[in-house]
């Protein structure tokens, strides 16, 4: 017995789900009652998801498996894997028994992208043409590790003096720090680019130092230039810093972090005490690095409705403040594609596909084409609808008619993560189903 | 109109060197780096090194470091590749490009025409 | 040293057909660069930072990337896309070139 998967891993974006394709050629007559299906990981060969006399056995995979019962009778075997984690990652066999037997293992590759790096200067006053400084490049909650590379203001790689480290989470999600060490020169842009190598996913920043000495006075709170982007569901952090003067003691700090808009207040430190959150109990600060000027936010389980402007006023003697903004994200699903009708097609006939994306925000960018890249703009509606979450679920349909064959192809883009993420279905000329059947 | 223009073809003798300008014109000489590749008859292309107008650094591959001299006049927006003790294998197209781009990609947007040096006895 | 391995070197087609030209980097690479060259000419820049076409390249050119493999697929080819490729990367010193592709007319 023939039993087909996919020979490129299938890849999955940690909290999404994921579709294991599996297949075989039923002979006419058979019914399900001859079936036995075996889904297990081909290494430990723990059982994962099984079908036998003729009923769906379950989950045995912590109940996030499911077949597609509707499509088994056409020989469509396919594990859906729910709320995919990093230990799911590896292979898996679809084992198929009908009078004959046969297998066939599908890997799973699982992908998490990393955030926007954030960029710290250690020192960062007083800054003068020679000193040496520490810039620390910061990004978060990738899978698998990270490529990190640096490079000067001009596109020249800086290769030297960097250290990289990368810790797992619980999740097994990494933490990527990466620290340049360079003499200033008259002045200097560096730019840290941590790469997914799965996803081939960029995300990057950089800093431009003007050595100079700080103007005396009011406090200086530094923020972050750039928004920072966080995946719904994970934690951010809201970067805020001032600098110490010596003697300094935490009994003179008064922070507060609020809405800039509506001055709501998110989370104050004031007479030495951290007065707690006032934001749904959603936000920390660091408190062992309050007295070295730090006066970062720590935002958890991030939601859509958190995007906007924070300010962090800080008062000494002196007082300051700045306002730094938070860009909220998910990634899209992959598309799936439906074609109507979706049987007997034929050249000439008018055919409507519709490419689905799930889970995204902010509101997706929809593009179409042909084979040969071609850009199809005619006859697309495309509509986004947000569900309570506030994630966009994408739906673009698009009308063509039909030539001799064709291939189209949907990549639906967040504009803020730049993932692109696309589904593509082939028309042959040939009267056919689609999908086409086994 | 952003321009890299060449200094003319050379023939030199072994044991000699060799200067090649690269005048450039449309647009700020300081603010890109200016790269020299090589490209001997029938071959691939060969990265030499680089200089950076406004900062007077330089870069070389290895494998010219001990030969070459990249200078630059800021006040003419000339950058110069000098390669000395030549040997015939040095005989090749020799071309000044721009590395132009914004942070963190940037590539060889304007090519100079070429100066061919010959080094024949 | 980062090594850009071309393949193949040489490669015979024919217009209309489709044709790819892989660049293997012998480690990790921050982004890859493509040029074009005919002869006599100067190279053209014709792919940047990775995948994106450089101004007036046509859309029948295309890159995918697998690991530190990368493949440019040209389509459909056009009597005018009959020339050399060079990929090239900066990721560390030196900067590196691949050997070359030249297409050629079967």
């Known amino acids: 017995l023939e039993v087909q998967v996919p020979e490129d891993p299938v890849v999955a974006l940690v909290g999404t789900d994921a579709t294991l394709c599996c297949s075989f050629s039923p002979e006419p007559g058979f019914s399900l009652a001859q079936l036995n299906l075996i889904w297990q990981l081909t290494d430990t060969k723990q059982l994962v998801h099984s079908f036998a006399e003729g009923q769906d056995q379950g989950s045995a995979y912590a109940n996030r498996t499911a077949l597609f019962p509707d499509l088994l009778a056409q020989g469509n075997a396919s594990l859906r894997l729910q709320r995919v984690r990093v230990a799911d990652e590896g292979s898996f066999t679809c084992f198929v028994s009908i009078r004959d037997f046969g297998s066939a293992a599908v890997s799973l590759q699982v992908a998490a992208p990393y955030s926007k790096p954030s960029m710290t200067l250690e020192p960062n006053k007083d800054l003068r043409p020679g000193d040496t400084v520490t810039i620390t490049c910061s990004s978060y909650q990738g899978y698998p590790e990270a490529e990190v590379f640096w490079q000067d203001g001009q596109g020249v790689p800086l290769t030297g003096n960097v250290t990289t480290s990368q810790m797992a989470n619980e999740q097994g999600l990494f933490d990527v720090h990466s620290i340049l060490r360079v003499v200033l020169g008259a002045n200097g842009t560096y730019s840290c680019l941590v790469r997914n190598p799965v996803l081939q996913q960029d995300a990057h920043s950089s800093v431009t130092i003007t050595p100079q000495r700080s103007p005396t006075g009011a406090v200086e709170v530094q923020v972050p230039e750039d928004p920072v982007v966080a995946l719904v569901g994970t934690d951010a952090t809201l970067r805020c810093s001032f600098s110490p003067e010596p003697g300094f003691s935490l009994a003179q700090l008064n922070l507060i972090w609020q809405l800039t808009d509506t001055k709501q207040l998110v989370h104050s430190f004031t007479e030495g005490r951290d007065q707690g959150s006032a934001y749904a109990n959603r936000t920390a600060l660091f408190p062992d690095l309050l007295a070295q000027g730090n006066a970062s936010l720590r935002l958890q389980r991030v939601r859509v409705a958190d995007e906007g402007s924070f300010t962090c006023f800080v008062s000494i003697r002196d007082f300051g403040s700045a306002a730094v903004s938070l860009q909220v994200a998910a990634p899209y699903s992959k598309p799936s594609m439906t074609l109507e009708p979706n049987k007997d097609l034929r050249p000439g006939d008018t055919v409507t596909i519709t490419c689905s994306s799930y889970r995204g925000y902010p509101e997706a960018e929809v593009f179409w084409q042909d084979g040969q890249g071609v850009p199809l703009t005619g006859n697309v509606t495309t509509s986004q609808m947000a569900n309570e979450q506030g994630l966009f679920d994408v739906h673009s349909v698009l009308r063509v008619v039909l030539g001799a064959n064709g291939t189209y192809s949907c990549l639906v883009r967040n504009p803020v993560l730049q993932q692109d993420a696309h589904g593509s279905v082939t028309i042959t000329g040939q009267p056919m189903t689609f999908p086409p059947e086994a | 109109e952003v321009q890299l223009v060449q200094s003319g073809a050379e023939v030199k003798k072994p044991g000699s060197s060799v200067k090649v300008s690269c005048k450039a014109s449309?647009?700020?000489?300081?603010?890109?780096?200016i790269h020299w590749v090589r490209q001997a008859p029938g071959q691939g292309l060969e990265w030499i090194g680089y200089?950076?107008?406004?900062?007077?650094?330089?870069d070389y591959n290895q494998k010219f470091k001990d030969r070459t001299t990249l200078t630059a006049d800021r006040s003419t927006s000339t950058a110069y590749m000098e390669l000395s003790s030549l040997r015939s294998e040095d005989t090749a197209v020799y071309y000044c490009?721009?590395?132009?781009?914004?942070?963190?990609?940037?590539?060889?947007?304007?090519w100079g025409q070429g100066t061919t040096v010959t080094v024949s006895s | 040293d980062i090594q850009l391995t071309q393949s193949p070197s040489f490669l015979s087609a024919s217009v209309g057909d489709r044709v790819t030209i892989t660049c293997r980097a012998s480690?990790?690479?921050?982004?890859m660069n493509w040029y074009q060259q005919k002869p006599g000419k100067s190279p053209k820049p014709w792919i940047y930072?990775?995948?994106n076409l450089a101004s007036g390249v046509p859309s029948r050119f295309s890159v995918s990337v697998s690991g530190t493999e990368h493949t440019l697929t040209i389509s459909s080819l056009q009597p005018e896309d009959f020339a050399t490729y060079y990929c090239?990367?900066?990721?560390?010193?030196?900067?590196?070139f691949g050997q070359g592709t030249k297409l050629e007319i079967k």
């Open positions: 449309g647009y700020s000489f300081t603010s890109y780096t």
């Open positions: 930072a990775t995948s």
């Open positions: 090239q990367q900066w990721s560390s010193n030196p900067l590196t």
């Open positions: 200089i950076n107008p406004n900062s007077r650094n330089t």
């Open positions: 490009a721009r590395y132009s781009g914004s942070t963190p990609y940037w590539y060889f947007d304007v």
């Open positions: 480690s990790s690479v921050s982004y």
